[in-house]
């Protein structure tokens, strides 16, 4: 058993059927030694009384708020969860897989530049009794510091027959450099409460690793004289990293025509612009990608060839 | 990344290309083992990310653009940066700074060619004969070094009497090339910086 | 932060019914149990009904086989239903929600109350 907050105690069972449990015992916070009755999740049922309280904690059943009391007066609460392992792995059934990169990927992390700002979501299908706590470092043993903010609910989608909630926090690295060499990961560790259900999530990366840009801006077409060529030209996205000339991106920029099976062409550059030919109905797109360090293109940026 | 690369000019900044080459056999380099060590913990997760060059070369802050001489997060070990020209340039006058910062590109690539061949030795010994280092890659080393033009000592190959635990030596070559590829990107960046300065 | 709203109350005959509802709206993370509580004029607050995280209820003697207590947790909504009310039953109730927000540590939120009065 560990606290994870203030009154609030982990009990870490494995999770098998008859499975001995863990014994608790609970201790009054009060200077009070006689007349203490213990109850559970505001119930009338008095457990035991005393300063202490023993319990052996098998199933959720046997989690909750446990109050002491005196004459009708409240001492003191603790609250239990459940921590399961079951066959030596512990339970994930709070966060859904999303198999992105890989299997068992429960947290997606990713940053639009070098600035050692970055946002993680996770994805669930449990719409209430739910509460999650953000915490992250580079490095886990000498850790030098990360801020998380609060996590929050950032969208709701319907998958079949399910509603699936999405939910991301935003950290940023105390004190970052963008042209540092990283040598220790960031790690990120969330924690996530159901109902009275206690499970702990884990990613760890390089922010190059986890760059993604922001899409092009300001993309434009330019026709030229006398031909079906247009010049297309867009500009860094305003949250990449400066200077570009050090920090620079290369582009993809792509002619798809209406129909998704039409061939695309590509042409990769690294200047903000580049010549090619518009068919009629088909569209232009440019997305970016670190130039140097091949992590996620961004989203495409697009404009219509008419 | 196999994309089309366009050829620089001939009056570029002449180390960009090489610079840019490196980046592009180092990749190449680090593919290629880690294909062929697929058994070995050779993905950036599962190596120790060690720096060869930690406390004797400074080239990420002694070659850090201007404009994050500002930012203090970049400073905490020196408090300088580069100023533009420098001796890739022709014939420009290279200031201190620029000098402090090819010549600590320069010693980089000098540290990592000594280790690249010494490991490279050991390699051929190994009787699986399962990896060497691409002689592309260590030539592209060769060629950046010798256009940054700096005259330095020499360094001694390693040599080791001990029989080589070839298991060890391709972990190590993992560590080296992952290590190097991060290197070669600051490198790229500041070959970049210094070409549009 | 957490919001509760009853409504339901109202003047009823003995004999009669009534249904309670308490919204509970705002950040309520992960709810460990609500309960419903009453306070009659010039009494002691006391327990009516409650309900843990696991939908278990558990009445006060008084009320068994008369009142039930449920909770939609889709709508973040506590009832309770009220039968056979008698004279006894008149007080304000009060909606009751306990819960862990994993951000602030564990809280207690109260309604401001329903009045429920039972009078021929």
């Known amino acids: 058993i560990w606290e994870l907050k203030k009154d609030v105690y982990v009990v870490e069972l494995d999770w098998y059927p008859d499975a001995p449990g863990e014994m608790v015992v609970l201790t009054c916070d009060t200077p009070e030694e006689d007349g203490i009755t213990w109850t559970l999740d505001q119930s009338s049922e008095v457990l035991g009384s005393g300063k202490t309280l023993t319990i052996q904690v098998k199933e959720f059943g046997d989690a909750g708020q446990y109050t002491c009391h005196k004459g009708g007066e409240v001492l003191s609460h603790s609250l239990l969860l459940l921590h399961k392992k079951e066959d030596g792995i512990w339970s994930t059934d709070i966060l859904k897989d999303q198999k992105e990169p890989k299997n068992k990927t429960f947290l997606r992390c990713e940053a639009k530049n070098y600035s050692g700002r970055f946002t993680c979501w996770w994805l669930t299908t449990i719409s209430t009794d739910l509460t999650f706590s953000v915490k992250s470092s580079r490095g886990s043993s000498d850790p030098q510091g990360v801020t998380c903010g609060a996590a929050t609910l950032s969208a709701e989608r319907v998958r079949g027959d399910n509603k699936e909630y999405e939910y991301s926090v935003e950290c940023q690295e105390d004190s970052a450099c963008p042209a540092a060499e990283e040598s220790l990961p960031i790690e990120v560790m969330v924690d996530a409460v159901h109902k009275l259900k206690y499970e702990n999530y884990t990613s760890s990366f390089f922010i190059r690793d986890i760059i993604k840009p922001d899409p092009p801006k300001n993309l434009q077409l330019k026709p030229l004289k006398n031909s079906r060529q247009v010049e297309v030209s867009w500009e860094y996205p305003d949250t990449w990293s400066t200077p570009h000339s050090y920090f620079s991106l290369t582009f993809c920029v792509q002619v798809q025509g209406k129909s998704k099976r039409e061939k695309k062409d590509r042409v990769f550059t690294d200047k903000t612009s580049a010549t090619v030919i518009c068919r009629k109905n088909a569209s232009i797109s440019v997305r970016a990608q670190d130039r140097y360090y091949s992590s996620s293109w961004s989203e495409w940026a697009s404009v219509p060839c008419s | 990344r196999n994309l089309p690369v366009a050829t620089p000019d001939p009056g570029m900044f002449p180390c960009l290309h090489h610079s840019q080459n490196l980046l592009r056999a180092v990749s190449n380099m680090l593919q290629k083992a880690r294909q062929t060590l697929e058994f070995y913990p050779c993905t950036s997760e599962e190596i120790d990310h060690e720096d060869i060059t930690k406390d004797k070369t400074s080239t990420v802050e002694a070659c850090l653009p201007l404009e994050l001489t500002k930012n203090e997060s970049c400073l905490n070990s020196r408090e300088t940066s580069f100023i533009t020209n420098g001796s890739c340039l022709a014939s420009r006058k290279t200031s201190f700074m620029m000098a402090l910062c090819l010549s600590s590109i320069y010693e980089d690539l000098k540290m990592y060619q000594v280790e690249f061949k010494t490991m490279n030795a050991k390699l051929l010994m190994d009787p699986k004969r399962q990896i060497f280092l691409d002689q592309n890659m260590l030539a592209v080393i060769d060629e950046l070094m010798q256009a940054l033009n700096f005259n330095s000592e020499t360094v001694p190959q390693k040599s080791s009497l001990e029989e080589p635990d070839f298991y060890k030596t391709k972990i190590k070559l993992c560590i080296l090339l992952h290590a190097f590829r991060i290197r070669a990107v600051t490198i790229d960046r500041v070959m970049s910086y210094l070409n549009a300065s | 932060q957490v919001q509760l709203v009853e409504s339901g109350g109202g003047l009823v005959q003995p004999g009669g019914s009534l249904r309670l509802s308490c919204v509970a709206s705002g950040s309520t993370g992960s709810i460990t149990s609500m309960a419903w509580y009453r306070q009659a004029p010039g009494k002691q607050r006391e327990l009516v009904a409650s309900?843990?995280?696991?939908?278990?209820?558990n009445y006060q003697e008084s009320v068994k086989g008369r009142f039930t207590i449920s909770r939609d947790n889709a709508e973040n909504t506590l009832y309770l239903q009220m039968n056979s009310l008698s004279p006894e039953d008149t007080a304000v109730y009060l909606c009751n929600l306990r819960g862990l927000r994993l951000d602030t540590g564990l809280y207690e939120s109260w309604g401001q109350g329903t009045q429920v009065t039972v009078s021929s």
């Open positions: 309900i843990n995280s696991g939908g278990r209820p």
